[in-house]
Structure formats: C-alpha cells, structure tokens
C-alpha cells in the first residue's frame, strides 16, 4: 500500500482545503524535474530560473554562464544547443509545433569567441530540425524536407538530398506514422560517433492515400489538411535509409545500406539505427507483419565506398506469441569490443530480459532474469551496465535502478537507488554523464519528485539538484486524496490496481466509483508516481474513488499477460475492467447505483465498450478522442496487435470490435463522446461514426466537439473540457455543484 | 592520363627488407586507394593489401601482417610497399595497381611491375 | 577466405570463335546490390589489364566483344569472336571479402 503521507491532525483541520478544480487547471501544483544537459564526464548546462544557459563542473564546484538571457531574449529564443566544441551554439526560436515530436522553427547560431550571431550564409527558415556533428560544429538540418550539411556554420551549406517534396518525399525526418508509431522522433538522421558519417532516412509516401479534415480558422473558408496516412491495411510509405561522407560529400555521395533479403522479400519497416563506431552501424527491421525484427549491422568498406551489411551479422528476433518486442522493439547497447551488445527481449519464460549477445540470438547469455522485467539499459561502460527494472518488492509500477557489474566474474547485482528514500521514491528514471562518471536520477514518486547527482563510481549522492520546496509548502494546507496499490487474483490472472481515495475515507460509507483506464497494449497505468491532477481533484473535493487497473495487454508483467490481447484487441481489456469493478463493488464501500468509467484515445475506445458491455454495471461514462474502428486508425500500430484487415487474416474481428457494432448497448448509460476536429492521430471520423451508429440506433447521448483542436485538447480546450466532464459527472453521481 | 610508375628491379637476401615505390600521375592521388599485388614466377596473383592516400586507412592481407608496411607521400603522389623478414618464397613480381572509382574492388590502372628476387 | 575455382585451366580455341571462361567462388561474393567478381587479361610480361568490373560491367576503352555475366557464386567471362589480341591469360578476382582473391587463372591459347 502507498499512503501519502498524512497531515491531517484535528487541531489542523480547519486549516485543511481540499483541492479545486481551478488548481488543478491552473496547474498549481505541479512539480519540476532537473535533467543535466550533460557536455562532457563532469560538465553540464542547465538553464537557470532567470534563462542563462549556465556551465557546471561537478569535480571544480565552479559554473559560469556561457550565454545570457539578454542573448537568448535578442531573438527570443525557446531552447538552445552548444556544438560540441563549445565555439557556437544554436538558438531556437519562432517554435511551431506540428504532430507529437515534430515542430519547425527559426534557428539563429551564435558564435561565443567573439559574442555576436554568425553573419552570412545563414540559415533558410522555418527548420523542420537542425543539430550539431557529435565533434566539432558541423551542422545537418532539414529545410523543406531535403538535407543539408554546414562544415560551419558561416560556410554555405552543401546540399545532400534534392527529392524531397511536402508530403510524398520525407528526407532526415519521419512522415507522419514514422514519427508517432515507430520512431518516436522528430529526426531520421543520426551522426556517426565522430561525424565522420551522416546517415539518414528516406521516406517515400507517394501511394499512401491521404487523410483530408477541415481546419476552420478564422477565415471565409475553412482550410483543408491532408496528411498521408496509413490506416490498416493501406499502403505503406517505402523506406530507405542512405549514409553519407560528411568529409567529402560530394565524392561518392549517399550510399544506401542494403535491407536483409529476408526482410526486402514482403512490406517491411525500418525501425531504427543505432552507430557502434564511425565505420560499424547497426539498423533495425521489421517485417509488416510485426513478429521478425532483423538486427542488421552493417561495414563500412573503404574500398567499396559503401556499406556492407554481411548475412553473418544479421540476427533474427521473432515472437511466436504476439508481436516482436514490446511497444517498439528494444534497441541494442553495444559493448566496448563494438561487435557484441545487450538487448532486452523475452526469455524462455516470457519476461523482458537483459542477453548479452556475442555471435548469433541463439547463443545469448541472460544477464537477468525472473517473474519481473528489465524495462531499459541505460549506459553499458567497460565495467557495469545501468538499467532499470520492476523488480523491487514485487510491485510491477515501480521503477529502479540497478548496476550489474560486468567487469567481474561472476557479475554483481546492486540496486542503487532501492533503499534511497524508499517511502518517497519507488519510481526512478536516470540520466549518464560520458563514461557515466555521473548521472542525475530523477524520482517520480509517489513522493514529492526530486532530483539528484550521484557519483558514477560509488554511487554516492553528491547533491539535490532539484526538490521541490514550494510546491511541499504549497501542498501542507491541502486535503489530498490517499492512494493505494494493491492487486487482485481473478482467474490465474493478477490485475493490479490503484485506488484513489477521498481525504476521510471511511470503509463504513458508500462512494461513488470512476474508473480511469487507458487500457492500450504495452502500457500501465498504475504506477508508483506522483500526480496533483484532475482525478485527484475528484477524490479530495468530490468524494470519488477513483480506480485505475491494468489487465491483460498491459505491460511489465510477462508475456503471458501483454499478448493475450494479440489479433483480439478490445475483448479481455474490456473484460478485465469489468472484473476489477466487481471486485471493488465486494469491498463493500462502493456505491453500485454510481459507476462511470471515463478514458481518453485507447482508453476512451475501453470505456466505450465498457460502457456497452451490457452489464449495467456502469450508470454513465465519457470517451475523448476514442478509437472506434480499428480500420480507422494508423498502421503500423494497429497491425502490430490487429493482423490484417483481410479476409484471409483478421478482418472478422476487426469487424467485431467497433464499438458502433455495440450501439444499440448505450441505451441505458449516459454516454458524453469528445473529439478535436482536427485531430491527426485519432481522426475525428471516429467519433463521427459513433454519432452516426448511437444517431441511427435512436440512442440518446451527449456528445462535444472541439474546434481546430487535435488529440491532445490544449490551450483552453483542456479547461472547457475539464469542467464540461466534472459538471457530467456530478451530474451522474448527483452531486451537488 | 593516368600512370603508375615504379621503381626498377631488386635482389635481396634472405632476411632482408625491400621497399617499393609506386608514383601516380594523371589523377587526384588523395582520392583512390592504392592496392599492392605479387605474382611469383610462373603463377597467379596474390593480393597484398592496399593503403588510402587520403585517409590514411590501410587494409594488410592476414598473412603478411607484421612483415608489410604500406605509406604513402602526398607531396609526391607516391606510394611505398616495404616487406621485411624476406624469404626466397617472397621472389616475385610486385605490382601497385590503382583502385577504380566506380569497381568496388576493381582495379583500373597498374604500374609495370618490380620484380623483386630474394636469393642468397 | 574466398576461394576462386577457373576452368578450364587451358582453353584451345581459333580466332572468330565465341569463349566461354567460368570462374567458381567457393561462397557467394553478391550482395542484394552489386557482384563483388572482376576479370582481368594478363598477357607474357605484362600487367594485367581490367576488362570487367561488378561481374558485368564494361571498363571504359575494352572491346564490347568481352562480357561479363552471373552472380552468387558463378560468373562467366564471354568473348563473343576471338581477335589474335585476346590470346592471353585471365583472371578472376573477388572484392567481396578480405583478403581479395584471385582465381588461378584460364590460359586462352590459339589452337
């Protein structure tokens, strides 16, 4: 059980308040984090509260600004980069964000020899992404999706791809279902370890047909956005990936890098690229049918020109159970010999694991292992590896650090940061210095956040960079909700399960219950952080329990449970949420009559089936931005879970699972349905069909529309919505408002 | 057009070294790499290693590793094989041959040859 | 390392007749993109001369009489009608893996 820790003693009570539903949206308690922009072993920058980019040294204890927020503000810039030889650094400015990751915007170099901007030669605007060669200050960017290259920044810039166009020909950066469902990045360019290289992808989104949806604006006529998208089953875009010679680019220009045969014979993906040395590079493919990744690693041969990617280096991962991987496929850390590497996949036993690899998958070494997962190697050095793991006490929702030393045999385990402060912090994330001769953790909970330097070598914790006082002094008048994880057996399976509980929880009483569920595969919800949110707010001000519980397709918890959801999606999701509101109901402090379920993208597509279950376990519920089809939606990730929409594969199910099939089911709940209209993830047709099925079934419902907004619902949206969901709920749980 | 020229004839005892040399004329010297190839008296050819003007990247066959030593001079577009430790199995002809732009291994041009005896 | 088979070891033929040369690598030396397998004339006293890169690809100032074919592991030089000239010695070499290799050699001579 996880209690926040209590400061409600009678004398104070009166001085208590509960949280509001304005703080949560005015974002008052909200806590900061401390990532070191690590330059060197012992270096880092960090940009101070008034906006100078400031330089540490940890061994000297010293720090000086290496550029004032009067430079910054001369072109208001936002963020900044230094090239690694410290002699320029970039500002960015005139940020315009796109989808997720991508954003374009104005880039300005400045140079710190003689304090003033680089004249001539500058750079095009907007940039779709710019960054420095890991040594010296080269420049590659991307402007209207072509790539060029700068020896320095004054110098005029060499064009290394002339094909690219909007939306058909993408050079350096993803195209749409690149970037949110296989790259996770804004870029599809990576520099060699040197700089001797540049390698990059090439994306071709011809034949991909497109998806069209107004943006209304404030002019006479709404303007239309076309993205090419790829629904399931769709065409594809046509990846290649090509390297460059950044010393002489012109000599023999890009070479492409061969695909495996056995990947090149069908639609296949790229799915990332990772250099071991300035002449070695390792790429990543998967077939279209996601269940074989082939590692390919890859030679430069000086007397070819070109790479050489031989059958010996190729090694072969493949799920017989699900899907390769789990959400993306795990990337390789190589080890200091440049051949050999680590690699999290499943063991024998169905759970994410460390293997050393040294010639071929077959022959991999297990460096961990047990009824928990590895969740991320961090760093490997000559003498340890740092990664991260659930298996602290058995709760799946933490997260440690741990060293194994690989230096010695046999090798050591030790968590580093399981007995810090353990009541505080259960939930770690940690950022390396360059040989990780330091490296900041960051805690996120369940207690207050905090963030601090330790010593690479004994782990000694070196200092607080960043605690969070004001919001612990912000937080002592607040009444807040105590949080519990526990878990339930049902069946063979285990469903964990976080339970929000209001200040004066009394078992004696009766509350009413919302379910929170995303639901996704390879996700969780119920993890040991820190949250001052909307639900929080619910539980504290409006007496709610709130439940979040991760069923079977969720993550960290072996095999067995993450790919029962495989080629089924929306049917043991569903029915797992279903079997822990029972379970919550035999606790005997819920309110029966008052049950919602409440989620947003996956999670609004789960509480719409939920909601239809015809259970009637549920009175109301709320779906944002829902999935209502699977043919609606992207690709590359529904096809991972889904299969095909064919005949011969999986169409039957993908049929079976929308939830208009189960319109007729929403006529006994109260259903609030939310969508962006101009949303490019989860596209508005979604909610649009919905509507369309609930409108011909004769089913009342409620529904809301946000204009021009995307899936995320920002800006002001996010109040509307907030409060438009809170007046529903109250609603539906009688509350008084 | 393009020329590889090299030196004249050697004899050489047992145990001794000999150092070949190869000038390019007519192209960029930095650009293409230079392989080194031998063909004892009546028999096929051997591949020896090659050496990159421009980069300095030297390939060595296994199995003359530790007794060859490639180099080039820039200044004078010359290349240099020296072989150490000679034995009379070493008795061949030695050829620079210049790797083609576009062959990937290929190689274009080739000097005349030095025949190097090693006798005692 | 890659080891080249040629045959025939001596092949007698009349000029204005077609030769067929083979060349056999013990593994294959073709990537999805390119045949690593060159050919070379070498005749007495001389260097030897490049006549086919990447397994079929001319080399600039050679008689389009020469060809090259095949991939994986067997390749076929072909001289489509033999000039006195083309009486010599010839070589297959690889570039696919170190150390480069070079066949034994296919001795053309007049019959």
């Known amino acids: 059980i996880v209690l926040r820790p209590s400061r409600v003693h009678n004398s104070e009570e009166n001085t208590m308040r509960a949280l509001t539903l304005k703080d949560i949206l005015n974002g008052t308690f909200s806590y900061k984090t401390f990532f070191p922009n690590w330059i060197s072993g012992q270096e880092y920058l960090h940009q101070s509260a008034d906006n100078n980019i400031v330089l540490y040294n940890i061994e000297t204890g010293q720090s000086y600004t290496i550029l004032s927020n009067r430079t910054m503000k001369s072109v208001n810039a936002s963020n900044y980069g230094l090239s690694p030889d410290r002699q320029f650094v970039y500002l960015e400015s005139d940020y315009s964000k796109l989808w997720r990751y991508s954003y374009t915007a104005t880039y300005y170099i400045y140079d710190l020899s003689n304090g003033e901007f680089v004249r001539g030669n500058e750079l095009p605007r907007p940039i779709q992404y710019l960054c420095w060669s890991p040594v010296g200050s080269k420049l590659a960017y991307v402007y209207q999706n072509n790539i060029y290259l700068k020896q320095r920044p004054g110098d005029p810039p060499f064009q290394i791809t002339f094909n690219g166009r909007e939306n058909k020909i993408f050079n350096g950066i993803p195209d749409w279902v690149y970037e949110e469902e296989m790259l996770a990045t804004k870029y599809a360019l990576w520099w060699s370890p040197n700089g001797k290289f540049l390698a990059y992808a090439e994306f071709n989104d011809t034949d991909i047909p497109v998806i069209a949806y107004s943006y209304y604006g404030d002019e006479q006529y709404p303007r239309t956005i076309n993205i090419p998208y790829p629904k399931a089953g769709a065409k594809n875009p046509v990846v290649r990936i090509f390297i460059i010679d950044t010393t002489y680019p012109a000599y023999v220009g890009p070479q492409e890098v061969p695909v495996p045969a056995m990947i090149a014979s069908s639609d296949y993906y790229f799915s990332w690229l990772t250099w071991v040395t300035d002449e070695r590079v390792c790429l990543q493919w998967l077939k279209r049918v996601q269940n074989v990744s082939v590692l390919s690693i890859c030679d430069f041969r000086e007397d070819w020109q070109t790479w050489d990617c031989p059958k010996t280096q190729e090694h072969i991962e493949e799920s017989r159970t699900g899907w390769a991987g789990g959400f993306f496929v795990s990337t390789p850390v190589f080890s200091y010999d440049a051949i050999s590497y680590y690699k999290i996949f499943s063991d024998k036993d169905g759970y994410k694991h460390i293997h050393y690899i040294k010639d071929t998958v077959e022959n991999a070494i297990q460096i961990t292992s047990g009824k928990w997962e590895a969740i991320n190697i961090f760093r490997v050095t000559q003498d340890s590896l740092f990664y991260s793991s659930n298996e602290f006490e058995e709760y799946p929702g933490r997260r440690n650090i741990y060293r194994i030393s690989i230096g010695s045999y046999p090798p050591s385990k030790k968590c580093v940061t399981c007995h810090l402060r353990k009541e505080r912090c259960q939930y770690y994330t940690a950022s390396f210095s360059d040989y990780a001769k330091y490296y900041a953790l960051v805690c996120y909970g369940p207690g207050i956040p905090i963030s601090t330097l330790h010593d690479g070598r004994t782990d000694q914790e070196i200092k607080i960079l960043e605690e969070n006082k004001e919001l612990e002094n912000a937080l002592k008048n607040i009444q807040l909700p105590k949080e519990e994880i526990k878990k339930l057996e049902v069946d063979e399976i285990t469903l964990w399960y976080k339970m929000i509980l209001p200040p004066q929880f009394d078992r004696s009483k009766k509350y009413p219950l919302l379910i929170q569920v995303y639901g996704g595969p390879c996700s969780q919800s119920v993890r040991s952080v820190f949250a001052v949110n909307w639900i929080s707010y619910l539980a504290s001000k409006e007496g709610m329990v709130i439940a979040l519980v991760d069923g079977r397709g969720t993550a960290f918890q072996g095999d067995k449970l993450l790919y029962a959801v495989y080629r089924k999606l929306g049917v043991y999701e569903v029915e797992d949420q279903i079997t822990a509101v029972r379970k919550f109901i035999e606790m005997g402090f819920i309110d029966e009559k008052r049950i919602a379920i409440w989620g947003w993208s996956y999670g609004g597509y789960v509480s719409s089936l939920a909601l239809a279950s015809g259970t009637g376990l549920f009175k109301c519920g709320i779906a944002v931005a829902p999935v209502s089809s699977w043919e609606y939606y992207a690709s590359v990730y529904t096809e991972r879970f889904m299969g095909l929409p064919t005949k011969d594969d999986n169409l039957e199910h993908y049929k079976n699972s929308t939830v208009m099939a189960r319109a007729e089911y929403f006529r006994n709940v109260d259903y609030l349905l939310i969508h962006g209209t101009a949303d490019d993830n989860v596209h508005f047709q979604n909610s649009a069909q919905i509507a369309k099925a609930l409108v011909n079934a004769q089913v009342d419902f409620q529904a809301m529309w946000y204009s021009d907004q995307n899936h995320g619902l920002s800006g002001l949206s996010t109040n509307h919505l907030y409060t438009h969901m809170t007046h529903f709920l109250k609603q539906c749980f009688s509350l008084s408002d | 057009q393009v020329q590889l020229v090299q030196s004249g004839a050697e004899v050489k005892k047992p145990g001794a070294s000999v150092k070949v040399s190869c000038k390019a004329s007519?192209?960029?010297?930095?650009?293409?790499?230079i392989h080194w190839v031998r063909q004892a008296p009546g028999q096929g050819l051997e591949w020896m290693g090659w050496i990159h003007p421009g980069s300095g990247s030297i390939k060595y066959a296994q199995k003359l590793q530790g007794r060859v030593t490639m180099t080039t001079d820039t200044s004078t577009s010359t290349a240099y094989m020296e072989l150490r430790s000679l034995r009379s199995d070493d008795t061949a002809v030695y050829y620079c041959a210049r790797h083609g732009g576009t062959g990937r291994g290929a190689m274009d041009y080739w000097g005349q040859g030095t025949l190097v005896t090693v006798s005692s | 390392e890659i080891v080249l088979t040629q045959s025939p070891g001596t092949l007698s033929l009349s000029p204005g007749e077609r030769a067929t040369l083979s060349c056999r690598a013990s593994q294959s030396v073709s990537t999805s993109a390119y045949s690593y397998m060159h050919w070379y004339q070498q005749k007495p006293g001389q260097a030897p001369r490049l006549l086919i890169y990447?397994?079929?690809n001319l080399e600039s100032g050679i008689p389009d009489r020469f060809s090259g074919s095949g991939s994986g592991t067997d390749f076929t030089l072909t001289i489509s009608r033999l000039e006195p000239e083309d009486f010599a010695v010839y070589y297959c070499?690889?570039?696919?893996?170190?150390?480069?290799?070079f066949g034994q050699g296919t001795k053309l001579e007049i019959k």
């Open positions: 070499q690889q570039s696919r893996e170190y150390p480069y290799t």
């Open positions: 007519g192209y960029t010297f930095t650009e293409n790499i």
């Open positions: 990447g397994a079929s």
